[in-house]
């Protein structure tokens, strides 16, 4: 194949791959007709002048996962056909000026996972055809104005996982074709007004895992094509009323892990394509009327692990498509009887780990399709007569870890539970808290010295018990989860939740069993 170096493999398709620790310099002679060259996992520490001079037809060059720390300015001379260049996963601290000069066809430049300390406008001034620039995983502390001014055709720019503390409002101003901008995992504390104004074609903006405290009111007003906006794990304490008003294409918005205290009515929207909204791990204390009213297509709403103590009766107005609502691990003591009235298509609701003392008898009156209700670990002593009677699809009801008062008033609930025992699951059953002489006894089999009619246990809906977000190992019968610290541990602390007892769906989603696919 026109002379293949012994330490490389060369294919008929003009592809050359050179790998192995024994390689300490660019192998020679390389086949003159090579179109793709990969130099991977070697001990090459530097690239000298023109090592690729005789392979001018090269289209793709990957020099990845080496010990590369130094490159001569003329290293890529004569590669005018090169479209793809990756120097990712090396040890580069400095890029020589002019390194990419002459690479007139270059479309993708990957410099990620190095140790680059700075970039300058002169670095990329010759790369006018560049479409993708990957700079994530370096040590960049700032981006100078003009750094990207010549990259007018750029569609994807990744600056994530650096050490950026601020961004100049002018640095992206010429990137009118940019579709993806990633700035995640930096140290940004604020984004100046106007920073994204020139990005009229932007579709994805990743700002998660920074230290952003405030969002300017008009920060996204020119980004009408934005589809995915990641703002999670920042320090955002409030949302300006108009900040999301001009984002009609948005279909993903993450705001979890911030310091949001309140949400103003209509803050979200109109966003006709948004189907999931994650607001867990904030400091939200109340939900006013119409706060989500623009989210007509929302299917999943996660409000768990906040400090919600009050929900206005019209808070969920407009959420006609909602299937799953997670309100667990908040500070709810009471709920208005009409609060869920508009949620006609709700299938799953998680209310566990609150301070609910009672529930209105009509709380689920219009939510006829409910399949799963999580009410464990509250302050419930009894429930109104017939509260679940109309819920023909209910196949999971969790009532344990409540201070049930087992006097004669408990009989209607007890009888219903006896009839519907399979719906309670097998993990933990509700037990009496008072009076003292029956404390700890199962609510279902308790004898309250009142005649109880014999019952026939009917078949419950055969909907599979499919745990959701994430899947849950069964609790040991002897374990109470009401005081476990894992209940509020952040989801990001663990990867495979299926192996961890208790740190399950009750941590964020609070959805178990009958969740839809």
């Amino acid at each position: 194949y026109h002379g293949c170096p012994s330490e490389c493999t060369c294919s008929r398709a003009s592809q050359v791959e050179c790998t192995g620790a024994r390689i300490v310099a660019v192998p020679t002679p390389l086949p003159w007709n090579a179109m793709s060259l990969q130099i991977l996992n070697t001990h090459i520490t530097e690239l000298n002048e023109s090592p690729f001079l005789n392979i001018s037809a090269l289209i793709a060059l990957r020099i990845e996962k080496n010990e590369l720390s130094r490159i001569t300015p003329g290293a890529f001379r004569n590669l005018g056909s090169l479209r793809y260049l990756s120097l990712a996963n090396n040890k580069l601290q400095v890029l020589p000026i002019g390194l990419f000069q002459g690479l007139d066809s270059l479309e993708s430049l990957l410099l990620s996972s190095n140790q680059l300390l700075q970039i300058q406008p002169a670095h990329f001034s010759q790369c006018s055809n560049l479409k993708e620039l990957q700079l994530h995983g370096n040590h960049l502390e700032y981006i100078p104005d003009g750094a990207f001014d010549h990259l007018v055709g750029l569609t994807k720019l990744n600056l994530g996982k650096n050490s950026l503390t601020h961004i100049s409002p002018r640095v992206f101003q010429h990137l009118g074709n940019l579709q993806v901008l990633r700035l995640y995992e930096n140290r940004l504390t604020d984004i100046p007004m106007g920073t994204f104004d020139g990005l009229v074609n932007l579709q994805e903006l990743a700002l998660q895992q920074n230290q952003i405290g405030l969002l300017s009111p008009g920060l996204f007003h020119n980004n009408h094509n934005l589809q995915r906006l990641y703002l999670s794990n920042n320090h955002i304490s409030q949302l300006p009323p108009s900040v999301f008003m001009q984002l009609p294409q948005l279909n993903r918005l993450t705001l979890f892990g911030n310091s949001l205290k309140e949400l103003s009515p209509g803050i979200f929207g109109p966003m006709p394509n948004l189907r999931e909204l994650w607001l867990y791990d904030n400091h939200i204390s109340s939900l006013p009327d119409n706060v989500f009213s623009n989210l007509r297509q929302l299917q999943v709403l996660i409000l768990s692990r906040n400090q919600i103590s009050f929900i206005s009766p019209g808070a969920f107005n407009g959420l006609t498509e909602l299937r799953e609502l997670s309100l667990h691990t908040n500070a709810l003591q009471d709920l208005d009887g009409n609060v869920f009235r508009m949620l006609a298509n709700l299938q799953n609701i998680s209310l566990q780990n609150n301070r609910l003392r009672q529930l209105p008898g009509n709380i689920f009156a219009n939510v006829n399709g409910l399949m799963a209700i999580q009410l464990q670990n509250n302050q419930l002593e009894n429930l109104p007569l017939g509260i679940f009677d109309h819920l023909g699809k209910l196949c999971e009801l969790r009532l344990y870890d409540n201070p049930w008062r087992c006097d004669s008033d408990i009989l209607p609930l007890r009888n219903w539970l006896l009839l519907n025992q399979p719906r309670l699951g097998t993990d933990t059953v509700p037990v009496c808290f008072s009076p003292a002489n029956v404390r700890g006894q199962s609510l279902i089999i308790i004898n309250v010295n009142v005649a109880v009619p014999s019952v026939h246990v009917p078949e419950v809906p055969s909907y599979p018990e499919t745990p959701w977000y994430p899947d849950t190992p069964s609790y040991p019968d002897t374990t109470s989860v009401s005081s476990t610290t894992e209940l509020t541990s952040p989801v990001e602390d663990y990867t495979d939740l299926t192996t961890i007892q208790v740190t399950d769906d009750r941590s964020v989603w609070g959805m178990t069993q009958a969740q839809s696919g």
């Epitope: 279909n251 189907r275 399949m371 977000y469 994430p470 899947d471 989801v491 663990y494 964020v508």
Partner: antibody, heavy 119, light 110 residues
């Protein structure tokens, strides 16, 4: 270009286990739901479950609970499905697929992995 | 689980003619604004390919001779003018509850 590339065909003995991989590229792996679907020879499609890499959450069809275990490795953007205690009725083509939102359709599919269980 | 019944099991249609496939759900899979029903095409030796999502929304890149309609329990996939490359098995799928698929309809050329 969005791609889901699955591992090669496997022939296994009854009672053993198999782990099928699904390497994702061309999209932000953690931002999509990864579904697994079974297709027995000459049969239709059966949903096994899904994994959401963003929070590490898994959901199973009750029928496959205890049979299939879904995991992901976000560092390599790879999803895995392990099937245990294999029996002849587990002989099938297994597909991974991507979904944008939880209730959305599966818009991209892997090429499938054939698992044959035979003594 | 929700049972999806497809009809017919197989269908032979002349090139350029209309092909219609039905899918009936054992319970409603629709709200006032959405139907949680999707359609896939599967050719021999290949994975399924998404054609229609949410009952009537054509997936990007799918020829507009494919269309979907219906709500509640009854849904239809229509190929307005059958082409040779449309020979395949077609499946409906619901995502209202635990996902289930129809048994498939085999479309052939007459």
């Amino acid at each position: 270009e969005v791609q889901l590339v699955q591992s090669g065909a496997e022939v296994k003995k009854p009672g053993s286990s198999v782990k099928v991989s699904c390497k994702a590229s061309g999209f932000t792996f953690t931002d999509y739901y990864i579904h697994w679907v079974k297709q027995a020879p000459g049969q239709g499609l059966e949903w096994i479950g899904l994994h959401y890499p963003y929070i590490g959450g898994t959901n199973y069809n009750q029928k496959f609970k205890g049979k299939a275990t879904l995991t992901v490795d976000t560092s390599t953007t790879t999803a895995y499905m392990e099937m245990s205690s294999l029996r002849s009725e587990d002989t099938a083509v297994y597909y991974c697929a991507r979904g944008d939102n939880k209730y959305d359709a599966m818009d991209y599919w892997g090429q499938g992995t054939t698992v044959t269980v035979s003594s | 689980d929700i049972v999806l019944t497809q009809s017919p099991d197989s269908l032979a249609v002349s090139l350029g003619e209309r092909a219609t496939i039905n899918c009936r759900a054992s319970q409603s899979v629709s709200t006032s604004s959405y139907s949680y029903m999707h359609w896939y095409q599967q050719k021999p030796g290949q994975p399924p390919k998404l054609l229609i999502k949410y009952a009537s929304s054509l997936e990007s890149g799918v020829p507009d001779r494919f269309s979907g309609s219906g709500s509640g329990t009854d849904f239809t996939l229509t190929i307005s003018s059958l082409q040779a490359e449309d020979v395949a098995v077609y499946y409906c799928e619901q995502s209202w509850e635990i996902r289930t698929f129809g048994g498939g309809t085999k479309v052939e050329i007459k």
